[in-house]
Interface confidence: medium
């Protein structure tokens, strides 16, 4: 019977998508670049069901964790690599009294079990998404 | 808003090191890739690398036996030196933030700086 | 190394008229998250160069709705849909795809 495999090794899959959980630290533009190179993405969270699961890898491991979200466009406008803004809603996911740009911090990194606002330079693990293959057929 | 100064001697030996420093001010150095870029009199442009930290960097390979670049975060600047210089390094010399693969482009440059190599 | 030629080199253009410059790279510079990597820039006469394009078409802050930037892959193109005479100088494209960056050799737009 052939088997089908909707994400690559070592990936992980949640409703549709795949995730690369990180082994090594990078900065947030150089773990933008890692991810394009697997044609992937920086991760884009869409889903209150999304943050919740990416929340629990991280918290987890108990590391800090690039996603792809950063105000560099515009200070205090937050908007995601593929373009899209920050929705009101998923700004509860903050940690309390963040963001608070101390220090020039433009990129967004999960952070026990919440986010926070950090400098882009500094070298964090991060996660890569990508569509899963598709097993029908 | 951010903006960038070079500096440096203008004038620098054969075989020596060319040596410039970009100050940034109105921003943080933190959060961008910076980068160097040169152009001999009446010629175009050419790029000879970039820097995020000082461990993170992508160097031209033309001159990458000879380029080295580092920032200093806490006096907001980053420097560009050039071993063993000739005749051929006399240029143009520019600075300029690299807004990375995420935002795209060169934005602001410097005014530029003239290094002459002579003896 | 990827190579960029731009054509032409030199173009005469009378204010109030249409210019187009073209920039053709030797590889394709779409990458698969949809974007190309490919950037424009405008030297003016004794200044810095300056930002006008960037990711294939869009108009950096503060340029003028008369320049545009279209296509992708391989072939790309700067208008400028009227030229004014403070748009003389020399355009560049470069990839920024992969390094080392790269860029064309340059067209010097003038006033007939």
């Known amino acids: 019977e052939r088997l089908c495999h909707p994400c690559p090794w070592e990936w992980t899959f949640f409703q549709g998508n795949c995730y690369f959980m990180s082994n090594s630290q990078r900065n947030w533009h150089d773990s933008i670049t890692a991810c394009q190179e697997v044609g992937a993405q920086l991760v884009v969270i869409k889903s209150a069901e999304e943050q919740n699961f990416l929340q629990l890898q991280s918290s987890r491991s108990n590391r800090f964790t690039w996603m792809g979200l950063s105000d560099l466009n515009h200070e205090g406008t937050w908007q995601w690599v593929d373009g899209s803004p920050l929705l009101p809603s998923f700004k509860q996911y903050w940690n309390k009294g963040e963001p608070n740009n101390v220090g020039e911090e433009d990129c967004a990194e999960f952070s026990g079990n919440g986010w926070n606002d950090d400098k882009c330079n500094l070298a964090k693990f991060w996660i890569c998404k990508k569509s899963a293959a598709s097993c029908s057929g | 808003q951010v903006q960038l100064q070079e500096s440096g001697p203008g004038l620098v030996k054969p075989s020596e090191t060319l040596s410039l420093t970009c100050t940034v001010s109105g921003g943080s150095i933190s959060s961008y890739y910076w980068t160097w870029i040169r152009q001999p009199a009446g010629k175009g442009l050419e790029w000879i690398g970039r820097v995020f930290t000082s461990e993170s960097t992508n160097y031209n390979p033309s001159l990458k036996n000879r380029v080295t670049m580092s920032v200093d975060t806490s006096k907001n600047q980053f420097s560009l030196r050039l071993n063993s210089v000739t005749a051929a390094d006399t240029a143009m010399y520019y600075c300029?933030?690299?807004?990375?693969?995420?935002?795209?482009?060169?934005?602001?440059w410097g005014q530029g700086t003239l290094v002459t190599v002579s003896s | 190394d990827i190579v960029m030629t731009q054509s032409p080199l030199s173009l005469p253009v009378t204010p109030g008229e249409p210019a187009s410059i073209s920039c053709r790279s030797s590889?394709?510079?779409?990458?698969?998250?949809?974007?190309?990597?490919l950037d424009w820039y405008l030297q003016k006469p004794g200044q810095s160069p300056q930002l006008l394009i960037y990711?294939?078409?869009n108009r950096a802050s503060g340029v003028p709705d008369r320049f545009s930037g279209s296509g992708s892959g391989t072939d790309f193109t700067l208008k400028i849909s009227r030229v004014e005479a403070e748009d003389v100088g020399v355009y560049y494209c470069?990839?920024?795809?992969?390094?080392?960056?790269?860029f064309g050799q340059g067209t010097k737009l003038e006033i007939k």
């Open positions: 990711l294939g078409s």
């Open positions: 590889q394709s510079l779409l990458h698969s998250n949809g974007y190309n990597y």
């Open positions: 470069i990839q920024a795809l992969q390094t080392p960056f790269t």
């Open positions: 300029a933030r690299d807004r990375g693969t995420y935002l795209g482009g060169f934005d602001p």
